[in-house]
């Protein structure tokens, strides 16, 4: 359907593919790509070559190529400013002659190792009540946090640590649509650190 918008997720500095998925390559005359402005035109190559790209905006020079035979478009060395809406007007030899495919490109950083910080709420009768906070280095969009083995969601975890839980390891996993990364802290280390007055744990 012309109205459908396909979300494409890309990683900063890496490549992303827009799935055009042309079923009949021989019918293609030209595909015109636009975003905020004209981006590129893609025309058939000869029998030996992939489709030929003409990049029309200098921000995309030498970062775009098209794959044969399905005309999927690849943008490499992704920049944050590449994010946004893209439109492919596909001109063919046969009816319907022109069809449009729409895309929304979201760009994310590949997540680094998260950092776990801790603060002591209370320590009573050999039970320590600790709050763990998990965060990635740069404030990122669409980052979710999960703690194992408890299965808790969110970047803050409050735990009541008893001597019987000494062998537990708490792992925080940060995830965005393109990557995930984890850090862990052992319960034994946690309460030992608290006893010694430390407030931060970071394995990275």
């Amino acid at each position: 359907k012309d109205s459908e918008i396909f979300t494409v997720n890309g990683i900063l500095g890496e490549s992303v593919t827009f799935p055009v998925n042309i079923q009949e390559p021989r019918q293609v005359k030209i595909i015109a790509w636009t975003s905020k402005t004209s981006v590129a035109y893609v025309t058939p190559g000869d029998s030996e070559t992939a489709p030929v790209v003409t990049v029309t905006h200098r921000n995309y020079y030498e970062r775009i190529h098209a794959l044969g035979p399905n005309y999927n478009l690849v943008i490499s060395d992704l920049r944050m400013e590449d994010a946004g809406d893209y439109k492919a007007d596909i001109n063919t030899q046969a009816d319907p002659y022109t069809t449009t495919k729409r895309y929304n490109l979201q760009i994310y950083r590949r997540l680094g190792k998260p950092k776990i910080t801790q603060s002591l709420m209370a320590s009573v009768n050999s039970t320590c009540n600790v709050t763990l906070t998990c965060s990635v280095e740069k404030e990122e969009k669409n980052v979710t946090y999960n703690w194992s083995p408890l299965g808790e969601e969110g970047n803050v975890l409050q735990i009541f640590q008893t001597p019987e839980d000494q062998e537990l390891t708490y792992t925080c996993t940060a995830q965005n649509p393109v990557s995930n990364n984890s850090d862990s802290i052992s319960a034994r280390q946690l309460c030992a650190d608290i006893a010694m007055g430390f407030r931060t744990h970071h394995t990275g």
């Epitope: 005359k29 025309t43 190559g45 000869d46 070559t49 030929v52 003409t54 030498e62 190529h65």
Partner: antibody, heavy 116, light 106 residues
Framework: QVHLQQSGAELVRPGTSVKISCKAS????????LGWVKQRPGHGLEWIGD????????NYHEKFKGKATLTADTSSSTAYMQLSSLTSEDSAVYFC?????????WGQGTSVTVSS | QIILTQTPAIMSASPGEKVTMTCSAS?????VHWYQQKSGTSPKRWIY???KLASGVPARFSGSGSGTSYSLTISTMEAEDAATYYC?????????FGGGTKLEIK
């Protein structure tokens, strides 16, 4: 047999306009870029712009925006380039050429002389 | 825009001699194409996609290069090769040409 037949030489006054043509035969006119190139006497080739007749898409060299206007008539397989506000700097031979990978084939050239 | 610089601007070679001319791009390009133009005639596509010979081009011609540096080589110069050769980058609009290398026969 591919052929690009360009219109004849033009002698025009400064400040006026000229429209030159390039009639294509021997290939599917709507499926390829049709480009225009300027060559002044004793000089190299300058790319002006091109048009894809099958969609009406046009690329211009920034230098020639406002100077050159590219159009195409798919019914007669003919491309046109109009040059406006002519000066002596516009005196040159203008070539048309077609292709999607490179300029595969070129017309014979149209000489435009701007003189009062 | 991407600027193509051809060197030398003019050169001469004796029959049988090996000839190399270069085309340098101001920033990286995927391919260049080469055109041959003889005086008073239209240019002809000569080498495309950096190294593919156009139909009818003698095998003594070859093209190579990548990134910002490209070259056209004639293994053994012949009189009919005397012409001006232009490189062009196609994939980034505007589709710029180099200034040309005029090859003369000694």
């Amino acid at each position: 047999q591919v052929h690009l037949q360009q219109s004849g030489a033009e002698l025009v006054r400064p400040g006026t306009s000229v429209k030159i043509s390039c009639k294509a035969s021997g290939y599917t006119f709507t499926n390829y870029w049709l480009g225009w190139v300027k060559q002044r006497p004793g000089h190299g080739l300058e790319w002006i712009g091109d048009i894809f007749p099958g969609g009406g898409y046009i690329n211009y060299h920034e230098k020639f925006k406002g100077k050159a206007t590219l159009t195409a008539d798919t019914s007669s397989s003919t491309a046109y380039m109009q040059l406006s506000s002519l000066t002596s700097e516009d005196s040159a031979v203008y070539f048309c050429g077609y292709g999607n990978i490179a300029m595969d084939y070129w017309g014979q050239g149209t000489s435009v002389t701007v003189s009062s | 825009q991407i600027i193509l610089t051809q060197t030398p601007a003019i050169m001469s070679a004796s029959p049988g001699e090996k000839v190399t001319m270069t085309c340098s791009a101001s920033s990286s390009v995927s391919y260049v194409h080469w055109y041959q133009q003889k005086s008073g005639t239209s240019p002809k596509r000569w080498i495309y996609d950096t190294s593919k010979l156009a139909s009818g081009v003698p095998a003594r011609f070859s093209g190579s290069g990548s990134g910002t540096s490209y070259s056209l080589t004639i293994s053994t110069m012949e009189a009919e090769d005397a012409a001006t050769y232009y490189c062009q980058q196609w994939n980034n609009s505007p589709r710029t040409f180099g200034g040309g290398t005029k090859l003369e026969i000694k």
